[in-house]
Interface confidence: low
């Protein structure tokens, strides 16, 4: 904490301006009126204060607003936002999307910090719902935020936001989330040519239906095993041996290493053994020759 000292003669700040960067920490504490700082917060961001000086300014605001800053101040925090703790932010009531955008802009290019996560949580709770503009904003700044949403919330995400999604942003998405995101991605990338389309859609294929996997198998995409292993089991099961071979291309050899894991294991159990043998990989567990194959999928769906 900065020691309380009298402001030297002639140093009392009349404006928040660049002259303040030459003030020592104790001079800032003594000579800058907190109310003046609050009303001219928009100027702080344009002044190259040191981190130590910013600590003093934050301290002054904390004293002025012990119950939490008003939105008029929050909107203009700029880099001072980086000095806030999650505990500070929990005291805020942020309702303006412009305020949210301004603060997210400060953190742009960095991973989502605990401060940002708390800010988003406060904002959404303050609004009472995750409306379309909020979602547009959050996915623009943090594509990875998608996987923290429920499938119901995800259904409100516009396909345009999908363009900003990187493969690693979907690492934490579960199948139910991908089930909602995949058709949006399919729509977003629909005008791309085959190879470019596959590169973009690949991360979302955990939500793809059988029909789309069959279509991809006709396009020489050479899906890697890591992607194949993330496909929905119910989407993979109806694929024929020939379709899987076309889908994986040269990566088909990787099936052997994965034969005990889903969805490969369950898929093998649904194939005729003589069809599996055509792959020459030594996959075992298929339906022996001469056995009748009954499709019980519809009966299961109805029961």
């Amino acid at each position: 904490e900065v020691e309380k000292t009298a402001c030297p003669s002639g140093k009392k700040a009349r404006e928040i301006d660049e002259s303040l960067i030459f003030y020592k920490k104790w001079e800032l504490e003594a000579c800058v009126d907190a109310a003046l700082l609050a009303t001219q917060m928009d100027r702080v961001n344009a002044i190259p204060f040191t981190y130590e000086q910013l600590d003093v300014l934050k301290h002054k605001l904390d004293e002025l607003y012990p119950q939490g800053y008003p939105e008029s101040v929050i909107q203009h925090l700029g880099y001072l936002f980086l000095k806030m703790s999650p505990e500070d932010i929990r005291k805020w009531n942020v309702t303006s999307l412009e305020t949210l955008k301004a603060l997210l802009e400060v953190n742009k290019g960095h991973e989502m910090s605990p401060q940002v996560a708390t800010l988003i949580d406060r904002f959404v709770k303050g609004r009472g719902q995750l409306d379309k503009d909020t979602l547009d904003t959050l996915t623009a700044f943090y594509p990875g935020y998608l996987c923290s949403l429920s499938p119901e919330e995800l259904s409100s995400v516009p396909p345009s936001s999908i363009w900003a999604v990187r493969p690693q942003d979907l690492d934490t998405c579960d199948p139910r989330q991908l089930d909602v995101l995949y058709p949006k991605a399919r729509l977003a990338f629909q005008n791309m040519n085959g190879s470019e389309y596959f590169v973009k859609i690949q991360s979302f294929l955990g939500g793809a239906p059988t029909e789309d996997l069959k279509a991809l198998s006709q396009q020489n995409v050479s899906m890697d095993l890591a992607t194949f292993m993330k496909l929905r089991t119910d989407a993979v099961l109806p694929l024929t041996v020939a379709e899987v071979q076309k889908l994986l291309g040269p990566h088909v050899e990787g099936l052997k290493a994965e034969e005990r894991h889903r969805p490969v294991r369950d898929w093998i159990l649904r194939q005729r053994q003589d069809d599996l043998d055509t792959l020459g990989l030594g996959l075992q567990g298929g339906i022996p020759n001469g056995y009748l194959v009954l499709d019980l999928s519809m009966q299961e769906a109805l029961s």
């Epitope: 719902q129 409306d131 379309k132 503009d133 499938p151 119901e152 259904s155 409100s156 995400v157 516009p158 396909p159 139910r176 089930d179 909602v180 995949y182 058709p183 949006k184 399919r186 729509l187 239906p209 059988t210 029909e211 789309d212 929905r232 119910d234 989407a235 769906a301």
Partner: antibody, heavy 122, light 106 residues
Framework: EVQLVQSGAEVKEPGASVKVSCKAS????????VHWARQAPGQGLEWMGI????????TYAQKFQGRVTMTRDTPTNTVYMELGSLRPEDTAVYFC???????????????WGQGTLVTVSS | SYELTQPPSVSVSPGQTADITCSGD??????ASWYQQKPGQSPVLVIY???RRPSGIPERFSGSNSGNTATLTISGTQAMDEADYYC?????????FGPGTKVTVL
Amino acid sequence: EVQLVQSGAEVKEPGASVKVSCKASGDTFNRYYVHWARQAPGQGLEWMGIINPSGVSTTYAQKFQGRVTMTRDTPTNTVYMELGSLRPEDTAVYFCAESRGSGYNYFAMDVWGQGTLVTVSS
Amino acid sequence: SYELTQPPSVSVSPGQTADITCSGDKLGDKYASWYQQKPGQSPVLVIYQDNRRPSGIPERFSGSNSGNTATLTISGTQAMDEADYYCQAWDSDTYVFGPGTKVTVL
């Protein structure tokens, strides 16, 4: 051009169930969300529920919870809506509708079936 | 449960502009769609995502949505535009239709 073709008109007694089908012709629709809505004679549209592309997830309007079941038969490109414990006030034209070219966001219903009249009468 | 309100009827002369309103709590925070339905026919989507027109829908149909009100505007209304118009929005995992507005071209 894709069309959604629904099953024919049905007459049912109170307490019975009805199962209406909706089949896509001209293109596969296993990648699209399908809604069901109904319209009582001279009345407005009422949303009943939605089934997702794989058929593993459904959401029903609260009013129909416990009475409606939506299923999907992928090989035949057909979606079904079954409504049980029928009452005279369930007499309506039942529509299936697909969320297609307009985008999956907010699931606007851009392709509609021709409707199936279900009459509930003793 | 979420409710949408529409005027029961709107009358317009040929060539004039018809504005059909749809009101709901914070409707501007949601996406609104509009459907046209003629007697004995299935509904047809004319506007989605507040102001976007599906292919094949004439340019005279436009939409806006802010505050508590979404509006479907038909500019240069034609006789063939006479129909019922329904607004629709998505709220809390549920899809809600308005009661419909009958547009009469005088």
